[in-house]
């Protein structure tokens, strides 16, 4: 059985620039200890969106929405979107390590698509 | 109903050894992260040691790390906790916790008294 | 580690009236918008028992005169009104960083 589980419950958003995206997240355990981070892209090349622990993010909030007692949420939202910013957003859950951390599991993803803003 | 009942708790001399052992019913244990924690007049409550879900991993504070040692039998709904190289400090009464998400301590066991004394 | 202050270490309040807790983290215990600090009851000869998870969610079966609020490091635990049955002695405990670490209790008593 799964020690922990990730997950982003949307496949996919769209969200009309200039707009916030609101990307949800949900762990089912805080075991094993270690920072949860979002990233876009995967491998190599992604992109860190947001570390709570380390960085500025200017663009990024955490949202927790109306809390369930069997999961814990790990949402955020990203304001001023624009067209750059579409791509799949991966909520990764890393397990504490020494010297570094090490990726424990991700979510499936989730892809955001930019609308041009309504004129 | 939930349950968790403690045994294994006794007067031990310092130095010795005991093994705390918490029996689970009620609920999916096998889907739980399980806990001790202690409880002296002294010091109130002190989280003691935690084993994720599947028995992978475990956590323990400085006071008793690499002294004491949790592990779980899930097909046995039961925790232990290997305890050696007791000190008068670890006298206590020792609870049983379950954690469904690793955060709060949802319920716990009446508890069982650990007394190391010369 | 994250030492938390809980204040008063006792505390008389007549029946149907407000008691109040509160516990101080001497580092921010929230992540991504939860903050992991819980309250717990203990009566005499008990173990405890949870009454508020994650700062402000009401344990199921906990009536609802408990209340939880607080953010970053403050943390309040309201009890109003105050009945004969919650005399006991009250902890929060933060799990947002190991080791996780409780208050040193609040007794509560009827005046």
């Known amino acids: 059985e799964d020690e922990l589980q990730v997950i982003q419950p949307e496949k996919s958003v769209s969200v009309a620039a200039g707009e916030s995206a609101t990307l949800r997240c949900a762990m089912t355990s805080l075991i094993p200890v270690g920072p949860i981070m979002w990233f876009r892209g995967a491998g190599a090349g992604r992109e860190l969106i947001y570390n709570q622990k380390e960085g500025h993010f200017p663009r990024v909030t955490t949202v927790s929405e109306l809390t369930k007692r069997n999961n814990l949420d790990f949402s955020i939202s990203i304001s001023n979107i624009t067209p750059a910013d579409a791509g799949t957003y991966y909520c990764v859950k890393f397990r504490k390590g020494s010297p570094d951390d090490v990726e424990f599991k991700s979510g499936a993803g989730t892809e955001l698509s930019v609308r041009a803003k309504p004129s | 109903e939930v349950q968790l009942v403690e045994s294994g708790g006794g007067l031990v001399k310092p130095g010795g050894s005991l093994r705390l052992s918490c029996a689970a019913s009620?609920?999916?244990?096998?889907?739980?992260?399980m806990s001790w924690v202690r409880q002296t007049p002294g010091k109130g409550l002190e989280w003691v040691a935690t084993i994720s879900s599947g028995g992978t991993y475990t956590y323990y504070p400085d006071s008793v790390k690499g002294r004491f040692t949790l592990s779980r039998d899930n097909a046995k709904n039961s925790l232990y906790l290997q305890m050696n190289s007791l000190r008068a400090e670890d006298t206590a009464v020792y609870y049983c916790a379950s954690q469904l998400t690793g955060s709060e301590f949802d319920y716990w066991g009446q508890g069982t008294t650990v007394t190391v004394s010369s | 580690d994250i030492v938390i202050t809980q204040s008063p270490a006792s505390l008389a309040v007549s029946l149907g009236e407000r008691a109040t807790i509160s516990c101080r983290a001497s580092e921010s215990v929230d992540s991504y918008g939860n903050s992991f600090m819980h309250w717990y009851q203990q009566k005499p000869g008990q173990p405890p028992k949870l009454l508020i998870y994650r700062a402000s969610n009401l344990e199921s079966g906990v009536p609802d005169r408990f209340s939880g609020s607080g953010s970053r490091t403050d943390f309040t635990l309201t009890i109003n009104p105050l009945q004969a049955e919650d005399v006991a002695t009250y902890y929060c405990h933060q799990s947002a960083d190991l080791p996780w670490t409780f208050g040193g209790g609040t007794k509560v008593e009827i005046k």
């Open positions: 009620g609920f999916t244990f096998s889907s739980y992260v």
